[in-house]
């Protein structure tokens, strides 16, 4: 169905990290252009990326309005130079995306260790609370502000002289772990949202080793 020489988009895919959300699709257009619409279950469709030859559309501004809603996008195909043309049903050819619920599905970006401090047999590791593209009252919210107690972190650590690893968990952005006095440690952190069924964990942060930069702040 649809207009002659116009093909429907396919492989519609959501790419989302820390709520920065882009819809991608195929094919690269030949003599056609695309327009994207996005809606919650309300059916109030909003058009974006009008008559584009790109095969991606940044929908961040729409999904951050309510990250707990479930969204659907659809990609319309039009003949280049004749965007008023429609298919035999009186509508342009289109394809729907999978459903997307940002709060449940956006990937959590790679965390960053902000600082670490050792005092005797205690080591405190602080994870930077990254900003997202979600706004409230005009200001961007951090991951912690968006996810609250749903967000946790896992610390993986070992003595610099050993390969034996240990883990610790926190529901804040800080770890306080017992260490051997005088020993140097290497560690990395991973964000986790235990309540999720998909995209539960981020990638690991870069490994930090004590004694290399003496635990200064890294912003």
């Amino acid at each position: 169905s649809g207009t002659t020489n116009t093909v429907a988009a396919y492989n519609l895919t959501w790419k989302s990290t820390n709520f920065k959300t882009i819809l991608e699709w195929e094919p690269k257009p030949v003599n056609q252009v695309y327009t994207v619409q996005i809606s919650t279950k309300s059916g109030d469709w909003k058009s974006k990326c009008f008559y584009t030859t790109d095969t991606e559309c940044d929908l961040t501004d729409e999904i951050v309005k309510d990250v707990k809603q479930t969204y659907l996008a659809r990609v319309f195909s039009y003949p280049a130079g004749n965007v008023e043309s429609t298919g035999s049903a009186g509508e342009p050819l289109y394809e729907n995306s999978p459903e997307f619920t940002p709060y449940l599905e956006t990937n959590i970006g790679q965390p960053v260790i902000q600082k670490y401090e050792q005092g005797g047999t205690k080591l405190k590791v602080t994870v930077k609370d990254s900003f997202t593209l979600v706004r409230k009252n005009g200001t961007f919210l951090t991951l912690r502000q968006v996810f609250g107690n749903d967000l946790g972190y896992i610390l993986t650590y070992r003595k610099s002289s050993s390969s034996g690893k240990k883990t610790a968990k926190t529901n804040t952005n800080e770890f306080l772990i017992d260490v051997d006095k005088g020993e140097n440690y290497c560690f990395s952190v991973q964000a986790v949202i235990p309540s999720r069924t998909v995209n539960r964990k981020s990638t690991d942060s870069p490994v930090e080793c004590m004694g290399q930069e003496k635990g200064e702040f890294r912003e």
Epitope: G2, K41, S42, G43, D44, W45, Q69, E91, N96
Partner: antibody, heavy 118, light 107 residues
């Protein structure tokens, strides 16, 4: 639990009017498109009309355009169908249904019977 | 308007049988198709949306498949409560249209 309760059906003469209501509960009403579907006695299902969550977008089947008006009051969690210039062929059970994205119909009311007869 | 044609119009089967109902669209509708079950004097109930996605709470013996113009609803092992009338519906474009229904009866 999603609940949809239609009311307002009854017997009306040809050319007359009725207003159907559908009271919704168990979900955030404004977050969903809603639809009316009808079923004539002993017949199949016929989609009649849909409305977006904001009320900004409305759609009708050709046979009711200009005669029926769908509307909603999100503050009252209620969907309406104003039916004017009724005809014998409008006789049916009218169902209200929740319609995610204005697409399929995932929850239905029990229906209200409209009979157009002299 | 897109015409939806179901077959067969009626079907007799026994509990435990595997049953398939087909629905054909007069033009391509991608996967924008839903299936409903209706029992006498009751409101329809949603079974399947997006051609193959099972509605929450619907038993897994129900499944849907197809894309484009040809679709099927399969009940893998009929239960006594499954005897009803089944309808397909396209939501590719307005006006949305239903198939004429398939009445599933006890043999």
């Amino acid at each position: 639990e999603v609940q949809l309760l239609e009311s307002g059906g009854g017997l009306v003469q040809p050319g007359g009017s009725l207003r159907l209501s559908c009271a919704a509960s168990g979900f955030t009403f404004s977050n969903y498109a809603m639809s009316w579907v009808r079923q004539a006695p002993g017949k199949g299902l016929e989609w009649v009309s849909s409305i977006s969550g904001s009320g900004d977008y409305t759609y009708y089947t050709d046979s009711v355009k200009g005669r029926f008006t769908i509307s909603r009051d999100n503050s009252k969690n209620t969907l309406y169908l104003q039916m004017n210039s009724l005809r014998a062929e409008d006789t049916a059970v009218y169902y209200c249904a929740r319609s995610p994205w204005g697409y399929y119909l995932d929850s239905w009311g029990q229906g209200t019977l409209v009979t157009v007869s002299s | 308007d897109i015409q939806m044609t179901q077959s067969p119009p009626s079907l007799s089967a026994s509990a435990g049988d595997r049953v398939t109902i087909t629905c054909r669209a007069s033009q391509g509708i991608s996967s924008r198709l839903a299936w409903y079950q209706q029992k006498p004097e009751k409101a329809p109930k949603s079974l399947i949306y997006a051609a193959s996605s099972l509605q929450s709470g619907v038993p897994s013996r129900f499944s849907g498949s197809g894309s484009g113009t040809d679709f099927t609803l399969t009940i893998s092992s009929l239960q006594p409560e499954d005897f009803a009338t089944y309808y397909c519906q396209q939501y590719n474009s307005y006006p949305y249209t239903f198939g004429q229904g398939t009445k599933l009866e006890i043999k």
